[in-house]
């Protein structure tokens, strides 16, 4: 049929909770293409009806929720004007009671469910939540050994759990929990994460590089909305935290009540030698108090700021 076959690695998934997989294969999916999902080489495409438990949502296949019988090989066919690619994804569903202590260890979980903290450092765990835009995610709760995590060493920031001064006691089984809403229905997502520790620097002590900002000023009108990206390059297995701060406080904490200024969700692009990270800061409405204040982008030991300034008056208008 003229389609190139591409085989993805197996995914191990937990039953009774939502799961989504995005059919992207750059650069194939960057142009104008059509994407169709199939199960087990069936000629009938996966439904696009949003009420269906399993349906295609744009380029995604969405399971609401995943069930034990959903194990199998799924194919997404990407058709361009002059090309066709068939991507095979092997999904294996398992039953896992996260708090069942009689079950020693987990099956061969995906790598994102195995994470490493660096002893003596400030580090973070990530709750990997890959869902289409139609899924609305609530706040994330974090658990260790089935108890909700509390204490001043732990901070929840977007999809990350920040852990300061990591100790040997921080190793073990974690879970992040979030309520997902889709078409008015709610589902629980509970991702188990096995967390190990190391003393190794991991990234060879290299310093992340902030590409932008460059300790520069930005001219912006009072009352406007502004989004500024912080672009960072760093080694592939770095453990650095990336965030925006003002007055040495995380912006989400500093503007906790008004939520007028917020940090965005971090994204990254992977290159051969390094990762390029982007985390933005959004000013819903620039106020007078924002001018002249350094908004700092932090990445590990690196930092750079932007400073807002009023545009110079345009005398030609007079």
């Amino acid at each position: 049929d003229g389609c190139n076959d591409i085989f993805m690695k197996n995914e191990m998934l937990s039953a009774s909770q939502p799961f989504a997989f995005n059919c992207t294969f750059p650069p194939i999916t960057s142009g104008e293409v059509s994407v169709t999902w199939y199960k087990n080489s069936s000629k009938i495409p996966v439904s696009k009806i949003i009420q269906s438990r399993i349906h295609q949502d744009e380029t995604w296949i969405l399971f609401l929720p995943m069930e034990w019988g959903d194990s199998g090989v799924y194919q997404c066919v990407i058709k361009g004007r002059d090309s066709c690619h068939r991507i095979h994804v092997n999904l294996t569903v398992f039953e896992k009671q996260w708090c069942d202590t009689s079950v020693k260890g987990l099956p061969n979980l995906s790598d994102e469910y195995k994470q490493i903290l660096h002893l003596g450092k400030d580090d973070s765990l990530t709750c990997h939540l890959h869902f289409p835009k139609s899924c609305i995610l609530g706040p994330i709760k974090w658990y260790k050994d089935c108890n909700e995590i509390t204490g001043e060493r732990f901070t929840v920031l977007e999809t990350r759990l920040l852990v300061s001064n990591v100790s040997a006691e921080d190793r073990g089984n974690y879970a992040c929990q979030v309520i997902l809403t889709h078409s008015g229905k709610q589902y629980e997502v509970l991702n188990g994460i096995t967390v190990s520790i190391t003393e190794r620097a991991g990234y060879g002590g290299s310093v992340p590089k902030i590409i932008y900002p460059k300790n520069n000023s930005i001219e912006v009108q009072l009352g406007t909305t502004l989004i500024v990206d912080c672009n960072i390059t760093d080694t592939k297995d770095n453990t650095n935290l990336r965030c925006w701060r003002v007055n040495n406080t995380l912006v989400d904490d500093y503007y906790n009540e008004s939520k007028r200024i917020r940090e965005g969700v971090e994204t990254h692009a992977s290159f051969r030698e390094y990762n390029l990270y982007t985390v933005n800061i959004t000013f819903l409405e620039v106020k007078m108090e924002d001018y002249g204040l350094p908004f700092m982008c932090h990445a590990g030991v690196s930092a750079a700021y932007i400073m807002l300034q009023l545009p110079a008056p345009d005398f030609r208008a007079y």
Epitope: N108, D111, K114, I116, L119, G120, A168, R171, G172, T194, V195, S196, I197, T198, E199, R200, A201, G202, Y203, G204, T235, K236, D237
Partner: antibody, heavy 120, light 106 residues
Framework: EVQLQQSGPSLVKPSQTLSLTCSVT??????GYWNWIRNFPGNKLEYM?????????YYNPSLKSRISITRDTSKNQYYLQLISVTTEDTATYYC??????????????WGQGTSVTVSS | EILLTQSPAIMSATLGEKVTMSCRAS?????MYWYQLKSGASPKLWIY???NLASGVPARFSGSGSGTSYSLTISSVEAEDAATYFC?????????FGGGTKLEIK
């Protein structure tokens, strides 16, 4: 159960390249740290280096110009190459990995060892 | 480079005797790891995170220490304990092993 199986020649000529393979079962080399250690005659252990879950490599500075650790994730194997060997590189070479009790540095799983003699 | 100096290099003990071997670091180490090596076998993880016994290690073994001074103790030596014991650190690269302590049974 994690198992590490080593393969490679036991005799290498001086100035040539020593190449060893570590085949891993029961774990994915895209998680954790995958190490090479050698034991010289007379029981002197030297930590040579590792390749991490992301492909990042660390080498002992004493070997940096001569050592290369690579991997093939599709085969779940990682490799050691040591160029320009001399008789001083005669040793038993081990691959090893940690993760015991969630401690990556606790090297619990070891290969069977490959005794390499450098001689013409 | 952190130098790990083990002492004694060789020690001899009688069955039932209590023995302690030392590992001294040239700079502070966060945790110490100990390995047992017997002739013709691969090293075995023996003690990790300074004081935790690996699976299968008899309870007569213990590890202790902090900073630059660490030790491995056997409360009552048995014949199967005859081996060479190495300490190792991952706190600072390059990661190093001690020179080993060979335990012989009289």
């Amino acid at each position: 159960e994690v198992q590490l199986q080593q393969s490679g020649p036991s005799l290498v000529k001086p100035s040539q390249t020593l190449s060893l393979t570590c085949s891993v079962t029961g774990a994915s080399i895209t998680s954790g740290y995958w190490n090479w250690i050698r034991n010289f005659p007379g029981n002197k252990l030297e930590y040579m280096g590792y390749i991490s879950y992301s492909g990042y490599t660390y080498y002992n500075p004493s070997l940096k110009s001569r050592i290369s650790i690579t991997r093939d994730t599709s085969k779940n194997q990682y490799y050691l190459q040591l160029i320009s060997v001399t008789t001083e590189d005669t040793a038993t070479y081990y691959c090893a990995t940690g993760g015991y009790d969630y401690v990556e540095d606790a090297l619990y799983y070891w290969g069977q060892g490959t005794s390499v003699t450098v001689s013409s | 480079e952190i130098l790990l100096t083990q002492s004694p290099a060789i020690m001899s003990a009688t069955l039932g005797e209590k023995v302690t071997m030392s590992c001294r670091a040239s700079s502070n180490v966060r945790y110490m790891y100990w390995y047992q090596l017997k002739s013709g076998a691969s090293p075995k993880l023996w003690i990790y995170l300074t004081s935790n016994l690996a699976s299968g290690v008899p309870a007569r073994f213990s590890g202790s220490g902090s900073g630059t001074s660490y030790s491995l103790t056997i409360s009552s030596v048995e014949a199967e304990d005859a081996a060479t014991y190495f300490c190792q650190q991952f706190t600072t690269s390059p990661y190093t092993f001690g020179g080993g302590t060979k335990l012989e049974i009289k």
